[in-house]
């Protein structure tokens, strides 16, 4: 369910607003509807980016109960694939604010799409 | 500076259908963002009527989601609402209104215009 | 259920502060946002996400939020900032977007 993957994205920015983390992260910030699918994969390997740097527990353990949670929504959607979409690599690095800015704006795509 | 600006008939007729335009300056419909319709009666508070995402995909407030059609020009750098088999109840303030990215807000809002429904 | 409760009205002695609220289940999962709007104008945003202020909104502008509850706070309230103040969050579908029904602020 992908309100629960915002219900995570929701607790992650709770827990980091007391910590210092300099990470810039590979962010996806105009999803085209195509390459949804991609992009939040890219999100998802980032974000555990966030679970090391922040060395916390509960961030480590929300962040694994999101990953678990948004790689079952997009099993339920059956094995899509997608072509000419960017590689994480080749996405822009922004700092953490707006890396969760850009992926509850994916995740609410996949919401408003569904 | 992103604006938007209603622009539509001011008096509709009962059981008529009630077509109004948001033109978007400053910025393009092509952006990242969802576009909303917002209205407000007079003297009441606001109720969101429906979404739009320029690939033109769209969400509607299940209330009025039988009547309510939201559509997009990007040639013209605008979206559109129409409201059909309107009532007196439909009477409001509407307003074109841009949400922000990530969590739920509208940063950008037009003027609003009044529509009146009445023979 | 997917409304966002507000009290109807609200007042503040000039330069106090004063907290308005926003109640429903969905605020677990989202950050609510709150809007300004004053007679005959359209609403204004002053707070989003976590606790956010657009640029132009004073830093007396604050939102907080715990459980199911969204708070925004007015730290030594202006004449100018009486107004109707709605909260705007979507509901527990993430589908659709819902607003308060609207607190009115008057400063003494």
């Known amino acids: 369910n992908w309100v629960n993957v915002i219900s995570d994205l929701k607790k992650i920015e709770d827990l980091i607003q007391s910590m210092h983390i300099d990470a810039t992260l590979y962010t996806e910030s105009d999803v085209h509807p195509s390459c949804k699918v991609t992009a939040m994969k890219c999100f998802l390997l980032e974000l555990q980016v966030i679970s090391l740097e922040s060395g916390d527990a509960s961030i480590h353990d929300t962040v694994e109960n999101l990953i678990i949670l948004a790689n079952n929504s997009l099993s339920s959607n059956g094995n899509v694939t997608e072509s000419g979409c960017k590689e994480c690599e080749e996405l822009e690095e922004k700092n953490i604010k707006e890396f969760l800015q850009s992926f509850v704006h994916i995740v609410q795509m996949f919401i408003n799409t569904s | 500076q992103v604006q938007l600006q209603e622009s539509g008939p001011g008096l509709v007729k009962p059981s008529g259908t009630l077509s109004l335009t948001c033109a978007v300056s400053?910025?393009?419909?092509?952006?990242?963002?969802?576009w909303s319709w917002v209205r407000q009666p007079p003297g009441k508070g606001l109720e969101w009527i429906g979404e739009?995402?320029?690939?033109?995909?769209?969400n509607y407030n299940p209330s009025l989601k039988s009547r309510v059609t939201i559509s997009v020009d990007k040639s013209k750098n605008q979206f559109s609402l129409k409201l059909s088999s309107v009532t007196a109840a439909d009477t409001a303030v509407y307003y074109c209104?841009?949400?922000?990215?990530?969590?739920?807000?509208?940063?950008?809002w037009g003027q609003g215009t009044l529509v009146t429904v009445s023979s | 259920s997917s409304e966002l409760t507000q009290d109807p009205a609200a007042s503040v002695a000039l330069g106090q502060t004063v907290r308005i609220t926003c109640q429903g289940d969905?605020?677990?999962?989202?950050?609510a946002s709150w809007y300004q709007q004053k007679p005959g104008q359209a609403p204004i945003l002053v707070i989003y996400?976590?606790?956010n202020r657009p640029s132009g909104i004073p830093d007396r502008f604050s939102g907080s939020s715990s459980g199911n509850t969204a708070s925004l706070t007015i730290t030594g309230a202006q004449a100018e900032d009486e107004a109707d103040y709605y909260c705007?969050?979507?509901?527990?579908?993430?589908?659709?977007?819902?607003f308060g029904g609207g607190t009115k602020l008057t400063v003494l």
């Open positions: 996400g976590k606790n």
């Open positions: 969905t605020l677990r999962n989202y950050y």
């Open positions: 400053g910025g393009s419909i092509s952006s990242s963002n969802w």
């Open positions: 209104a841009r949400e922000g990215i990530g969590w739920p807000s509208f940063d950008y």
């Open positions: 739009i995402y320029h690939y033109g995909y769209t």
């Open positions: 705007n969050s979507r509901d527990e579908s993430g589908k659709n977007l819902v």
